[in-house]
């Protein structure tokens, strides 16, 4: 069976084709080659000499037991080599020779027992080394690591490392890899020698499910003393053994680390005293809790010095009391409990993401809701009922506003967005909004992107509601049940580049409403019920138009519509997916491609 | 279409078939077997994925005695610092994991429950596997 040509001459997918040897019938120019799940078993010298341009090579689960000297010798452009799931028993010293551009090496689950004998010391360009799910017992980073000056990611998770000694990291003292991210999760750790991490700088350190008791966790974290880490991730996994007990003593050792950003990811334990628990983390710039249960929600009003707080997928008894002077960014998403939003006091806040919480807002939105006048980004998408009772008083700095898939009430009773003259992006898609007021978008003089798919209009008619949106470049009006539009609806949108009118209910096509859209490049009218043109003679669309989508409509392919069908043929260079433009009537033409019709007036006589 | 038996409990019998053409082997054990009146137990899965499990989610299509319920999307792996350790599993890496589950107080009416589980993962998104579970429910008392 042949390989699948994904991108001609470039990308080939040869997965699970029962190949016993490297195929020799692929082009020399191949850059991406997936040979995974083939029983190759043995890689001899110059195995890939036919592919000198190769950049990505996937050899996952190829039953490879032996890799000889120079197996990849000709691959000087290779940047990614994947060896996952191969039961390697014999790895020659020169196995990886010739890989002068290799940036990513994945040797997950390859029976690797030690880094010491792993012949990669010459791979100076290496940025990412993933040796997770192996049998490595020692964390000693071999001397050759001093050659790997570009290394940014080292994944040692799911190995057998139990202890870390001062000598293990000596090589990092000699040449500090300032940008190294290290993942040691799922190693059964019970000892970190104090001083082992002293004066070590890491970009990120991840330690999840490493400790089988509170005491071990406590002493190991104390063993991290002196570490300077940009981002520290601690926690557990839901499907692994979890700590029986967890209290404030667990994290006391963090006072002896320098941490910029902290994240606690999954804990099968109720956190009841945040202030004591995170006492050593009051001054990190970014603080993040993922998948934890928080009992006392008042604790977030303590004077923490955080600039970014992230609470994701957590459980709360009620919406937390948030009073944080220095906070600039708050991400509070996919949380459970506390269904009603209560006011927060965050005077420095610029970025607020409250999406996917099922929250309801009694009144939205003004500065008193968020306790700030600095807000630039507000995401309230995928929530419950949001009643618009104020027009963003004190929130005039907003640039990005997202309400999609929440249920907006009172949207058509006044000019809700009147004060948002700096707003650039607005998404009110699928918000149960029924447009019954022409001033709905008044005030949005800087708006560039407007997404309002999945809403409805009075009498299914699009009126002149965009008159002030002179900077609009993207407008999505899909799925709005529209049947008619005002001939002047788009007259002020001279900057508009993309207009999505798909999935509406137009019976006819008219070019007239688009005559002023001098910048229009994409017009999507797919999934409507267009049968013919509104007027006998269709004018041209703006000359800027590059893509016109008329697929999945109801073209009436009879003689009486000959001029319209001819006009469609004349637009061929603009049309996308022409094979999906089919006749719907009459019954003998149903399913025929419109462009393949021989439009003569014998058609239906 | 070959049917794979999972287990029997006092009020349910569970089996599955593949609903994709690839039919990559997957081993599923439930201990103790699910009782629909209330249940607590461990789900053990052994599987070698054909793509990375990053951003794994399930589309669930549930049918109760021929009545179709709306499609449900269950996100399992968000993409960073996920709840489950298998979210970091790579294509070709052995996934051998045990997940605890519990539910109580749900009253199911007697009959045939079908659940099509479509596993989607990766970027770009592609189907990882598709299994159709059939649960025959014989309640002792309802």
């Amino acid at each position: 069976e042949p390989c699948v040509e994904v991108v001609p001459n470039i990308t080939y997918q040869c997965m699970e084709l029962n190949f016993y040897k490297i195929p020799d019938n692929l082009p020399f120019s191949t850059k991406n080659l997936d040979l995974s799940f083939n029983p190759l078993r043995h890689l001899g010298s110059y195995s890939f000499f036919s592919f000198p341009e190769l950049q990505v090579l996937d050899l996952s689960r190829c039953e490879i037991q032996t890799i000889e000297d120079g197996a990849y010798q000709s691959l000087s452009h290779l940047s990614t080599l994947i060896l996952t799931g191969n039961p390697i028993q014999s790895l020659a010293l020169g196995a990886f020779s010739g890989l002068s551009s290799l940036q990513k090496l994945v040797a997950v689950e390859t029976n690797l027992a030690s880094l010491e004998n792993f012949p990669i010391g010459h791979l100076k360009t290496l940025k990412e080394l993933n040796v997770a799910h192996n049998l490595i017992q020692s964390f000693k980073l071999p001397e050759y690591f001093s050659n790997l000056t570009n290394l940014e990611h080292l994944d040692l998770s799911s190995n057998k490392i139990q202890s870390i000694y001062c000598t293990d990291l000596r090589v990092l003292h000699q040449m500090p890899l300032l940008n190294l991210s290290l993942d040691l999760s799922l190693n059964p750790m019970n000892f970190i020698q104090p001083g082992a991490f002293k004066e070590i700088r890491l970009h990120k350190l991840t330690l999840r499910n490493n400790f089988d008791s509170l005491n071990v966790m406590k002493t190991c974290i104390q063993g991290l003393a002196g570490l300077e880490v940009h981002r520290l991730v601690l926690g557990e996994f839901r499907n692994e053994g979890n700590l029986e007990k967890f209290d404030k003593s667990a994290l006391e050792g963090l006072c002896n680390l320098t941490i910029e950003e902290f994240r606690l990811a999954y804990l099968d334990y109720y956190l009841d005293d945040i202030i004591d628990l995170f006492n050593c983390l009051t001054n990190v710039s970014s603080f993040s809790l993922v998948s934890v249960t928080i009992e006392r929600v008042k604790d977030f009003s303590y004077n923490f010095g955080w600039q970014h707080l992230e609470l994701v997928n957590c459980k709360f008894g009620q919406f937390p009391t948030l009073k944080l002077k220095s906070l600039k960014r708050l991400t509070f998403t996919s949380n459970k409990g506390g269904n009603a939003f209560s006011e927060v006091d965050l005077p420095s806040l610029e970025f607020l993401d409250l999406s996917r919480n099922g929250l309801s807002f009694k009144g939205c939105c003004s500065q008193s809701d968020f306790g700030t006048t600095s807000l630039k980004y507000l995401d309230l998408s995928f929530n419950g009922v949001i009643t618009m009772s104020s027009n963003f008083l004190g929130l005039e700095q907003l640039e990005h506003l997202d309400f999609q898939h929440s249920n907006l009430k009172q949207m058509s009773e006044f000019s809700v967005f009147l004060s948002l003259r700096n707003l650039i992006y607005l998404d009110i898609s699928h918000t149960h909004t029924r447009v019954a007021f022409n001033g709905i978008f008044n005030g949005l003089s800087s708006l560039e992107v407007l997404k309002m798919a999945g809403n409805s209009f009075q009498e299914n008619f699009l009126p002149d509601i965009f008159t002030e949106l002179r900077n609009l470049t993207f407008l999505d009006l899909s799925q709005c049940q529209l049947e008619q539009l005002s001939p002047t609806a788009f007259n002020s949108l001279s900057s508009l580049q993309v207009l999505n009118m798909s999935h509406n209910n137009f019976f006819s096509l008219d070019t007239f409403p688009y005559k002023c859209l001098n910048s229009l490049q994409v017009l999507d009218y797919s999934l409507n019920h267009i049968m013919t043109s509104k007027k006998q003679e269709l004018q041209h669309f703006p000359s800027s138009l590059a893509f016109l989508n008329l697929t999945q409509n109801d073209f009436a392919c009879t003689c009486e519509h000959q001029s319209f069908l001819q006009w469609i043929k004349d637009q061929r260079q603009l049309l996308v997916e022409v094979e999906r433009m089919e006749c719907a009537t009459p019954s003998d033409k149903q399913g025929m491609p419109v462009l393949s019709l021989n439009i003569t007036c014998q058609m239906n006589k | 279409q070959k049917q794979y038996w999972v287990c029997n409990s006092s009020d349910a019998s569970i089996s599955y078939t593949y609903c994709d053409k690839m039919q990559y082997p997957i081993s599923i054990n439930v201990n103790p077997c699910i009782e629909l009146k209330r249940s607590k137990g461990l789900l053990h899965i052994f599987y070698i994925p054909r793509r990375d499990l990053k951003q794994l989610y399930f589309n669930l299509y549930i049918t109760v005695n021929t009545m179709n319920l709306p499609k449900r999307k269950e996100v399992i792996c968000r993409g960073s610092d996920d709840d489950y350790s298998f979210c970091r599993a790579l294509k070709g890496e052995t996934v051998n994991t045990t997940i605890s589950f519990s539910f109580k107080g749900i009253k199911f009416s007697k009959g045939k429950y079908k659940c099509v589980v479509e596993a989607i993962s990766g970027s770009p998104e592609e189907m990882l596997f598709c299994l159709e579970f059939v649960i025959l429910h014989q309640p002792n008392s309802n």
Partner: nanobody, 119 residues
Framework: EVQLVESGGGLVQAGGSLRLSCVAS????????MGWFRQAPGKERDIVAR????????YYAESVKGRFTISRDNAKNTVYLQMNSLRPEDTGVYYC????????????WGQGTQVTVSS
């Protein structure tokens, strides 16, 4: 399951009038397009008229423009076709059609009602 039942067909003299009715049952069709097709003897089935949910948009085949009027009463789940100035070439079976609530065109069909125009 949606059922469409047409009525009002019959034999009429050229120049006369008929009013066809179509009642939908099984579910409300107030949010979908409805219409009428006709199949003249020895010809293909083709669309005659179509109407949008709000009645804002209508479509008529060129041959019936000015003579036929489509209308609907969403409260009664009914669509009508008023046919005036009938001609012998209007003879055929008239079918009521409705789109699906998901937007698929011409999804549901009635059994048809015979209209015969004699000269």
């Amino acid at each position: 399951e949606v059922q469409l039942v047409e009525s009002g067909g019959g034999l009429v003299q050229a120049g006369g009038s008929l009013r066809l009715s179509c009642v939908a049952s099984g579910r409300t069709l107030s949010s979908v397009n409805m219409g009428w097709f006709r199949q003249a003897p020895g010809k293909e089935r083709d669309i005659v008229a179509r109407i949008s949910p709000s009645s804002v948009s209508t479509y008529y085949a060129e041959s019936v423009k000015g003579r036929f009027t489509i209308s609907r009463d969403n409260a009664k789940n009914t669509v009508y076709l008023q046919m005036n100035s009938l001609r012998p070439e209007d003879t055929g079976v008239y079918y009521c059609v409705a789109d699906s609530p998901g937007g698929r065109s011409y999804e549901y069909w009635g059994q048809g009602t015979q209209v015969t125009v004699s000269s």
